[in-house]
Interface confidence: low
């Protein structure tokens, strides 16, 4: 496609010069005469048109091998200096030079902004030889130009170790404004000022910016890009975008949502994962964060008991993981549990409360009045005790654990017996004679084994001794257990 071409210099009148193939043979006029006429349209070049005097890089005149004739300086002919076209159009431009035939192996390379253009570019070089000179036309074409094609293009020719450089051809690809910075989504505090930035470039310049809030323009007068919009505060969510205008038209940025930070929504789905006698492991699903990161959470625990004083225990924890092990609870108790979380704005409401229970605990006291005596005729030891005064939280008594340790010279042996909850006495076989038997008893519930009673010792004599006196734990509050032998 032929594109709009505009020169920065004044255009020349149209000159219908001879076509390639009927080249001028007057070398002097061809290479070094000052310009007389010859407008050079952007996409049409004739190698025979005289160029305007060249002030750039030229090859110095050389003496021929015969030494009889000076050759004039070599220079690329002037061509269009500035091509302006719209994005996605095609463009073709060229540079031309006439080279005396005494120079061999001339090649032309294209350069853009100081870098050689290699590879898959549409560059074509055509040679039109005559008796003494060869006209060379190097064409460069770009299909569907983009902004990245903007720049200064030159031809270079190496000849006898000299470098000849053409005038630059500046390609300016114009299009709709292109955003280099668009507004970003933000979460802001209510009624607090914030800035949004929008920047767009051409060409063509200038680019003017209008700001849009919720589909309505905010500024009546456009601002030159870049533009910073200072919003002194919002009370509700808004969507902002910016419009960039230039002579080619309008581009609209993405719309960005400006959210107003608020307190979080309450957590949901509070769940019980594990209960023990004195702890409950809970988890929850966080609510909406109110456009501000969670900072921490608070687990609130109320005992559900008509006799409790209704106080709330509060346990603070980090916002993640969304789990917490509540400790220091009473055994076999019912609790109501809620969770609240906070962000920089404040605390959420409490989640829906859930009910949870701790399991039975182990007994907290040992059986009382433990007595032990030897029944020699049966070769066993009788043990008696009183049921401990366990609290409700310890749960239901399931039995007792009896520990008896037998010690004689060089021997120590511990045995454990389990008896049912209805018993308050037990008999154990004598394991060793001429030895000491130490007895301790603990109450057992589903929650575990309680503390053992203080030890009661009895001496088991060798066969033949008779002693029926019992050993017993003292009444509560007394000193060490008494051993009677």
């Amino acid at each position: 496609a032929i594109t709009e071409a505009r020169e920065e210099a004044k255009p020349y009148p149209l000159f219908p010069g001879p076509l390639p193939g009927s080249l001028q043979t007057d070398h002097t006029s061809l290479l070094s005469l000052p310009h007389t006429s010859g407008y050079q349209p952007a996409l049409m070049f004739s190698p025979t048109q005289p160029g305007r005097p060249y002030t750039g890089n030229v090859a110095i005149p050389r003496v021929t091998s015969a030494g009889s004739k000076l050759l004039p300086p070599l220079a690329f002919k002037h061509t269009v200096g500035h091509i302006i076209l719209s994005e996605h159009k095609d463009v073709k431009f060229n540079c031309s030079i006439s080279v005396p035939n005494i120079y061999q192996d001339t090649t032309i390379s294209w350069w853009k902004d100081g870098k050689e253009l290699l590879g898959a570019h549409h560059a074509i070089t055509q040679f039109y030889p005559d008796d003494e000179v060869t006209a060379i036309i190097a064409s460069f074409s770009i299909t569907s130009v983009q902004r990245s094609d903007n720049g200064s293009y030159i031809c270079k020719m190496k000849i006898n170790n000299e470098e000849i450089v053409s005038d630059p051809i500046y390609i300016e690809v114009q299009g709709l404004p292109h955003f280099t910075k668009q507004p970003e989504s933000m979460n802001v505090t209510r009624n607090t000022a914030f800035n949004l930035t929008c920047q767009a470039v051409g060409p063509p310049e200038p680019v003017n910016i209008f700001w849009v809030q919720n589909s309505s323009r905010v500024n009546e007068q456009p601002e030159k890009s870049p533009s910073v919009l200072t919003v002194p505060g919002l009370t509700e969510m808004a969507v902002f975008s910016c419009e960039a205008h230039n002579d080619k038209g309008l581009t609209v940025s993405k719309g960005v949502q400006i959210n107003i930070k608020a307190i979080p929504s309450p957590p949901t789905e509070v769940s019980i994962h594990n209960s023990t006698a004195h702890s409950i492991l809970i988890s929850w699903v966080p609510g909406f964060d109110g456009y501000s990161p969670f900072r921490n959470c608070s687990v609130q625990v109320k005992e559900v008991d008509p006799l409790s004083n209704g106080s709330v225990m509060i346990f603070n924890t980090s916002a993640s993981p969304h789990m917490y092990q509540i400790k220091q609870l009473q055994a076999l108790a019912n609790y109501s549990i809620g969770v609240s979380c906070m962000n920089e704005i404040g605390w959420s409401a409490v989640s829906p409360w859930i009910l949870a229970s701790t399991t039975e605990g182990a007994p907290s006291v040992a059986p009382l009045n433990v007595t032990v005596f030897l029944n020699e005729s049966r070769d066993n030891v009788d043990i008696r005790w009183m049921k401990p005064l366990t609290k409700r939280q310890a749960g239901e008594l399931v039995g007792y654990r009896i520990s008896h340790v037998w010690q004689s010279a060089g021997i120590s042996k511990e045995l454990l017996e389990e008896v049912g909850q209805n018993n308050s006495r037990a008999q154990i076989s004598v394991q060793v004679h001429n030895a000491t038997c130490t007895v301790r008893i603990a109450a057992v519930t589903k929650g575990g084994v309680g503390p053992f009673s203080d030890p009661v010792k009895i001496f088991i004599p060798a066969h033949g001794w008779v002693d029926h006196a019992p050993s017993s734990t003292p009444a509560p509050g007394n000193a060490d257990p008494v051993l009677i032998i």
């Epitope: 809030q213 589909s215 905010v218 002194p232 009370t235 509700e236």
Partner: antibody, heavy 121, light 107 residues
Framework: QVQLQQPGAELVKPGASVKLSCKAS????????MHWVKQRPGQGLEWIGM???????NYNEKFKSKATLTVDISSSTAYMQLSSLTSEDSAVYYC???????????????WGTGTTVTVSS | DIQMTQSPASLSVSVGETVTITCRAS??????LAWYQQKQGKSPQLLVY???NLADGVPSRFSGSGSGTQYSLKINSLQSEDFGSYYC?????????FGAGTKLELK
Amino acid sequence: QVQLQQPGAELVKPGASVKLSCKASGYTFTSYWMHWVKQRPGQGLEWIGMIHPNINTNYNEKFKSKATLTVDISSSTAYMQLSSLTSEDSAVYYCAKRSPYSNYDWYFDVWGTGTTVTVSS
Amino acid sequence: DIQMTQSPASLSVSVGETVTITCRASENIYSNLAWYQQKQGKSPQLLVYAATNLADGVPSRFSGSGSGTQYSLKINSLQSEDFGSYYCQHFWGTPLTFGAGTKLELK
């Protein structure tokens, strides 16, 4: 030139409501925020809130349950309804247009003539 | 909310004198301040915006200054038409708030 026309006076009974109007002319109504300001006799100025015909409303928390701002774009008129009126609501109510100098500079280059609301049985 | 404290509450002055009215904000308002004049029974009129800029048609004897939290309005060589009430107003976020006003009376 830019004008904001308001009726001169309204007499209303306690507990009733009143709807004040502010007719704009001389500028693009849909491009500017319209603000409402209260002035009790012999007192200072209190900002009630503002409305943008295409964007949203923004109220002073103090007046949120008292005032409701609306617009009729077809007639370039802004309205403020005041509800559950008491003697405390007796005042001059002004509408005011924000200045065109920049986007969010909420000061007022044009004020309405003001409507005097008297709440009396 | 940002509080605007204006002083003095009233001022008795003669024609030709110079007066200064001050306004203090409860926090930094970054020069987002306007001054208005109101005459008895009339609507307020904008005098100064953005702390220092004179509104269209305002005589040059009026000038605004200040930054941060402290602002002032100065009237040089007071004229008879300058008597009335003066209000400052911040526009650094909402709610917008006004000073309580300064009443300028003829001595």
